[in-house]
């Protein structure tokens, strides 16, 4: 505990100290004060350096004196035979004695006391930055007017900071400007504008006079300007060394200004105001801004319109524009959306075509649809190129965004027929020469193909079964060979209106209207053995002559056989109707005149016996077609006849190319549309 | 009509083999496919082969592969069917059968040839 | 190949009784099904082809249906004469391979 005075007394005092002794005394006086240490009596053992006995004085880490030997007053007026004055409030006085003495020495009385020092002038570092007012005991630190003591309660300096300016307009200036600015202070003044507008700083190089850098360059006394993560200086020196309009990019700025204690010189004066916020006009390839401005600032809205073939992508919903307004931070907003390449996607494929996988499916792309040749070709033109148009689809010149559509090649046979060996007046044949043959089974007869959803036959084969069962694609009928052919399944049979339905159709004498439709369930798959044979035309380039030749082929009985294994087939020529009432019935089921003979038959063969027979009936009678003779039409139906090997009765199908697209057309679905 | 006449009733040892023939009447073999079928005695159907004339191949069922052969003589309008490598399963009749048309399977029978193998 | 399994291999029945006999392909084999009887030292005769179509000469007694892989003959009312061994056939596949039989006899 602290004390303000007190005694310190050798060992035995005052008798002789005992040898080997070591003791300390630890002097504490309250805080402020310093000590006063004085000696009374001193009679220790003397030696050189007083190695030997000594007492020992030592403050903090210093040795205030080291005492040995006798000692008397110079002064006969005070006993006081040696003193210490030391300026700290705390003292260490050791004694220490040797192994032996010579002599009997009494040892030393010593005498403390706490002293007023005077802080304001006792030591090296002056402890105020201005006035020092000595009390006993402590101190305290003074400010001349306008100075306010800092809470370390030693600095004084001016009441400069805390100013928070928000005008949008203003002046700043150092304290007392033009007047010297004051010494050690440290001033803060804050700008707070409304966000989105920037503070922008003048200054003119005259309006700034700080306290120059020293040798190594760092300013002794500083002004700095801090916008958020930027910083601005420290500037210092005889005119404003910075750039003279401070464009900070933020609506926040700190001016901090810091001087030292010495050298001051009349400061600085700067004006700011604030700027709406400029956001940078970017560069966004493939569009247009409107309004183009040489500047955009905060608030400012743009509306940016992509190019053609370009559009902004957000989520999976495309557009062709968007607007984007300058924020407070001075960045654009939407700034993520670009305008892209439309991208019209993966093509779409088309039925019986393909279209090649595209190196690009973006804008300005180009993809070329091929239907399957030679068995289908592009039906609605256009040439099968597309490209990717800026609406995002694919575009055909002709067609626009319309697919193409392959639809089947008709009349064309993959290999054409050769007649061989004659074959009870006919040829063996391939389903390759008469790839539109179509083999019903039950009645045992024929049809023709004549697009992916129709078969065309005689209205005798289908009067007596609704739901026929079919097959295309094979030369031979022989089951093994139907289960690996296609077979075709019925969803509708329409029978000509104008053939007479009868209850004993065995009886039958009049074939005309002999024509039927098959409406198939499903489309037919075009190939080398399975393709249309065409539909007459209208004009009267299609109106048969006697003698025009034309193709049959069936699966009828032959001279041989009653039912063919093999297509058979055979060249014919046409003939007068009245060759074919010439001819006597040879199983008559009435009277010869009982027959009708109309204008919509065809009597053709009598050459070299050959002829259609039963089970050949509804097949084609193939003639060429007269505008393109790589094709063949079908001109007739097998329909009767009164004689096989002579001739024979073929529906004139020319006279019904009405009803049959009229019924295609009321019969369709939407995907054959 | 077709008719279909199989050659007389085999005797024949382990390992030997057989050849049955069946000729036909009332059509031309290159107007008919020819199946070979066999039943053994007390027991099921069992289909052998046929000679495909479309596809100018023959095609076997997989359990006589590599022992039966299947041949046809168009000039004489007859068809052979060789069995080897005999074995006491192999006791059975064998029968000659035409293909039908237009989904019918099988058309003609012949009468069958039994053909018993035994030591 | 394609495996066929016919059930049952035996089945016990009364005249007038109503018998169905099924056939299973191991995969389609579409309508290419053919149904056969036998009576003993006999050749077997064709009654249904194309799984559903009744041969001609067939009493309509007896009916096939089914298609791709199930298949059933029924013979509506057991006739005496109807006592024999049923087969099927499929003909879908380049072999043509039979069931393995359902032997009709008298309960």
């Known amino acids: 505990e602290p004390t303000m005075y007190g005694e310190i007394l050798s060992p035995n005092y005052p008798q002789a100290y005992p040898s080997e002794v070591e003791k300390s005394w630890d002097i504490e006086v309250p805080e402020g004060y310093g000590i006063h240490l004085y000696f009374t009596h001193l009679d220790i053992e003397l030696s050189e350096n007083c190695a030997y006995d000594s007492v020992q004085i030592i403050s903090g880490d210093t040795e205030e004196g080291r005492l040995c030997g006798q000692r008397s007053s110079n002064n006969p007026h005070s006993p006081i035979v040696e003193e210490f004055q030391v300026p700290y409030n705390k003292l260490q006085v050791i004694f220490k004695s040797d192994f032996s003495n010579e002599e009997r020495f009494t040892g030393f009385a010593a005498y403390y006391v706490a002293t007023d020092i005077n802080e304001c002038t006792d030591f090296v570092d002056v402890p105020c930055s201005h006035f020092c007012n000595n009390f006993i005991g402590g101190y305290f630190c003074s400010c001349p007017p306008e100075y306010f003591l800092h809470d370390d309660m030693k600095n004084c300096g001016v009441n400069c900071s805390g100013d928070v300016f928000t005008a949008l307009i203003g002046e700043i200036a150092s304290p007392n400007y033009p007047k010297p600015y004051p010494e050690n202070s440290r001033c803060e003044y804050q700008i707070r504008l409304e966000k989105g507008f920037q503070v922008v700083v003048t200054l003119r190089r005259e309006d700034f006079d700080v306290e120059a850098a020293d040798s190594a360059g760092n300013c002794l006394d500083s002004l700095v300007f801090v916008a958020g993560d930027r910083q601005f200086g420290p500037y210092c020196g005889h005119g404003f060394p910075g750039p003279l309009n401070i464009e900070t990019k933020s609506n926040a700025l700190d001016i901090i200004f810091q001087t030292d204690l010495t050298g001051q010189k009349k400061g600085w004066k700067l004006r700011y105001h604030g700027d709406p916020m400029p956001c940078p006009k970017e560069d966004t390839p493939n569009s247009v801004w409107e309004p183009a401005k040489a500047k955009y600032v905060f608030r400012d809205v743009v509306q940016i319109t992509c190019l053609d073939g370009f559009e902004v992508v957000e989520g999976r919903v495309g557009a062709t524009s968007f607007y984007s307004t300058c924020q407070s931070n001075g960045k654009w907003s939407n700034s993520k959306l670009k305008c892209q390449p439309v991208d019209c996607g993966i093509p779409e494929s088309i039925e019986n075509g393909k279209v090649e996988d595209p190196e690009s499916t973006l804008f300005g792309s180009v993809i070329r649809y091929t239907c399957e040749e030679p068995y289908y070709y592009m039906e609605n033109g256009g040439g099968g190129e597309y490209h990717c148009a800026g609406n995002g689809s694919w575009v055909n010149e002709v067609l626009g965004p319309e697919l193409p559509k392959c639809v089947p090649v008709c009349g064309v046979p993959r290999e054409p027929f050769e007649e061989k060996q004659r074959i009870i007046g006919g040829s063996d044949a391939d389903i390759k020469n008469f790839p539109w043959q179509v083999f019903f089974d039950n009645p045992w007869a024929g049809g023709a193909l004549i697009n992916e959803y129709w078969v065309l036959t005689a209205a005798h084969v289908v009067e007596g079964n609704r739901e026929p069962t079919m097959y295309v694609g094979s030369t031979s009928v022989q089951t093994s060979r139907l289960a690996k052919s296609k077979m075709l399944t019925p969803e509708h049979v329409f029978i000509h209106p104008g053939w007479k339905l009868l209850e004993v159709p065995e009886g039958r004498t009049n074939f005309d209207n002999d024509i039927a439709l098959v409406r198939l369930k499903d489309p037919v798959k075009m190939g080398p053995t399975v393709s249309p044979i065409c539909l007459p035309g209208t004009s009267s380039d299609y109106n048969l002559m006697d003698g025009d030749l034309g193709l049959i082929s069936g699966w009828g009985r032959t001279e041989k056989r009653d039912r063919a294994v093999r297509l058979k087939a055979a060249r014919l020529p046409v003939a007068p109707l009245r060759k074919c009432k010439e001819v006597k019935v040879e199983k008559p089921t009435a009277d010869a005149e009982a027959y009708v003979f109309t204008p919509n038959m065809i009597c053709a063969g009598g050459e070299k016996g050959m002829d259609s027979c039963k089970g050949d009936s509804g097949g084609a009678f193939a003639v060429q077609d007269p505008n393109d003779k790589t094709k063949f039409y079908a001109a007739g139906l097998v329909s009767w006849g009164p004689q096989c090997g002579t001739y024979g009765l073929y529906t004139r199908v020319k006279n019904y190319v009405d009803w049959i697209m009229k019924t295609m057309q009321e019969n369709s679905t939407p995907r054959e549309d | 009509e077709v008719q279909l006449v199989q050659s007389g009733a085999e005797v024949k040892k382990p390992g030997a083999s057989v050849k049955v023939s069946c000729k036909v009447s009332?059509?031309?073999?290159?107007?008919?496919?020819m199946h070979w079928v066999r039943q053994a005695p007390g027991k099921g159907l069992e289909w052998m082969g046929t000679f495909d004339p479309e596809e100018g191949e023959t095609i076997y069922a997989q359990k006589f592969q590599g022992r039966v052969t299947m041949t046809e003589d168009t000039s004489t309008d007859t068809a052979y069917m060789e069995l080897s490598y005999l074995r006491s399963e192999d006791t059975a009749v064998y029968y000659c059968?035409?293909?039908?048309?237009?989904?019918?399977?099988?058309?003609?029978w012949g009468q069958g040839t039994l053909v018993t193998v035994s030591s | 190949d394609i495996q066929m399994t016919q059930s049952p291999s035996t089945l016990s029945a009364s005249v007038g009784d109503r018998v169905t006999i099924t056939c299973r392909a191991s995969?389609?084999?579409?309508?290419?099904l053919a149904w056969y009887q036998q009576k003993p030292g006999k050749a077997p005769k064709l009654l249904i082809y194309?799984?559903?179509s009744l041969e001609s000469g067939v009493p309509s007694r007896f009916s096939g249906s089914g298609s791709g892989t199930e298949f059933t003959l029924t013979i509506s009312s057991l006739q005496p004469d109807d006592f024999a061994t049923y087969y099927c056939q499929q003909y879908n596949s380049p072999s043509w391979l039979f069931g393995q039989g359902t032997k009709v006899e008298i309960k």
């Open positions: 995969q389609s084999i579409s309508s290419w």
């Open positions: 194309k799984a559903s």
């Open positions: 059968v035409t293909e039908g048309l237009a989904g019918i399977p099988f058309d003609s």
């Open positions: 009332g059509d031309t073999l290159t107007e008919l496919s």
